[in-house]
Interface confidence: low
Amino acid sequence: MKTLPAMLGTGKLFWVFFLIPYLDIWNIHGKESCDVQLYIKRQSEHSILAGDPFELECPVKYCANRPHVTWCKLNGTTCVKLEDRQTSWKEEKNISFFILHFEPVLPNDNGSYRCSANFQSNLIESHSTTLYVTDVKSASERPSKDEMASRPWLLYRLLPLGGLPLLITTCFCLFCCLRRHQGKQNELSDTAGREINLVDAHLKSEQTEASTRQNSQVLLSETGIYDNDPDLCFRMQEGSEVYSNPCLEENKPGIVYASLNHSVIGPNSRLARNVKEAPTEYASICVRS
């Protein structure tokens, strides 16, 4: 006798129900079946500047009761607890962050750190995360955050100051690129051609920069891994999340076509704070010297 597909399904269903109490899938007597997890990325690094405040985050995933979390600094094989240091919790919908505050960063803060959680008499340790501290004195040539923020407009400020040859060259390049681009434009769908997610562009530039700076730069992803480096030119704060904005003139394509679509930009809308609101297309020209 052949086993009917429907019967097979019922049989499987029976076994699932039979095994549920043993698999601990259901929430029995209010007990949640999940472990505490610490989402510090393996070999994560932060390049930071002495004298700047910094927040080192330990992403913590837990169910009912928040575990007791501590930070320690690796010293050889031992990890020295950092007890007097200012710490705080940042709660978000699906994950919490136990933050170690460096207010500000000191040269001796260089080194590897680890967070650990005590949960139901279990000790869970994270991967270590390394801080590379650049001393203020050796970084005295570093441009100010205000200078960094104003750099995108540097080109336009220079134009009146004898920038006519540059303007002509730019226009010529733009014309050539537009001609070349027209051929490709037909291949793209209407929306794909018009709307580039600025956050994606930002991430791409971070990935490029990461390959040159060996620095993990990941926005909060679905897996809950979150590494922010506050020293990529300047910090931007949106709510309680810190996003790093790499130097705006680096690692960008020559011409980026985009129409402003604030629903696409999402929480990082400050990325476009220097861009005037317009429903029309625009081309952002990146000129390298």
Partner: antibody, heavy 118, light 112 residues
Framework: EVQLVESGGGLVKPGGSLRLSCAAS????????MSWVRQAPGKGLEWVAS???????YYPDSVKGRFTISRDNAKNSLYLQMSSLRAEDTAVYYC????????????WGQGTTVTVSS | DIVMTQSPLSLPVTPGEPASISCKSS????????????LAWYQQKPGQSPQLLIY???TRDSGVPDRFSGSGSGTDFTLKISRVEAEDVGVYYC????????FGGGTKVEIK
């Protein structure tokens, strides 16, 4: 109650050495950042040295290489070893709890006077 | 190093009248991530050690009378005494703890 009591001040010749002590009570010294702040006669306040609970020590350029901050956790005491003393080091030296970066000195001792003179 | 500049150097006051002390830093003491200004105010009465009045630029320390208030952000800060009392005589210092520790030169408050 938190109490900080400094001792070890006195008269010393230029180029000489002196060790200041600060006996802490009412808290576990090893769990807190500690600092020394000085005040020259008729002048303002000047930060001299800091030690954090992790043992990291910090100094301004004016005393770097000459002064050493340390602590004895068993004795719950803080120390400031001063060498190559100069006339400009003459001051009242205060022991403070807090006062490392990111934290203002919130408990102060009564101070001990150091006079550097020939 | 961050330089702290206080003014005036001396402030003669009448009891019951308000008083204001200004403090300027050579660079911003505001950390954008936590929106805190790393500035404190101290009072030093004659023959005594300094006492913390205000931290985070505007938070009064416990036990400090509410006639004392701190304000300002970035590089410009102010300590205000709403109604000066005779016991408020002394030297007032501002101090930054953003990067290293530096104090202002002090403002001597005295009764007219």
């Amino acid at each position: 109650e938190v109490q900080l009591v400094e001792s070890g001040g006195g008269l010393v010749k230029p180029g000489g050495s002196l060790r200041l002590s600060c006996a802490a009570s009412g808290f576990t010294l090893s769990s807190y950042g500690m600092s020394w702040v000085r005040q020259a006669p008729g002048k303002g306040l000047e930060w001299v040295a800091s030690i954090r609970s992790d043992g990291n020590t910090y100094y301004p350029d004016s005393v770097k290489g000459r002064f050493t901050i340390s602590r004895d956790n068993a004795k719950n005491s803080l120390y400031l070893q001063m060498s190559s003393l100069r006339a400009e080091d003459t001051a009242v030296y205060y022991c403070t709890r807090g006062g490392y970066y990111g934290s203002s000195p919130y408990y102060w001792g009564q101070g001990t006077t150091v006079t550097v003179s020939s | 190093d961050i330089v702290m500049t206080q003014s005036p150097l001396s402030l003669p006051v009448t009891p019951g009248e308000p008083a204001s002390i200004s403090c300027k830093s050579s660079q911003s003491l505001l950390y954008s991530s936590n929106q805190k200004n790393y500035l404190a105010w101290y009072q030093q009465k004659p023959g005594q050690s300094p006492q913390l009045l205000i931290y985070w630029a505007s938070t009064r320390d416990s036990g400090v009378p509410d006639r004392f208030s701190g304000s300002g952000s970035g590089t410009d800060f102010t300590l205000k005494i709403s109604r000066v009392e005779a016991e408020d005589v002394g030297v007032y210092y501002c101090q930054q703890y953003y990067n290293y520790l530096t104090f202002g030169g002090g403002t001597k408050v005295e009764i007219k």
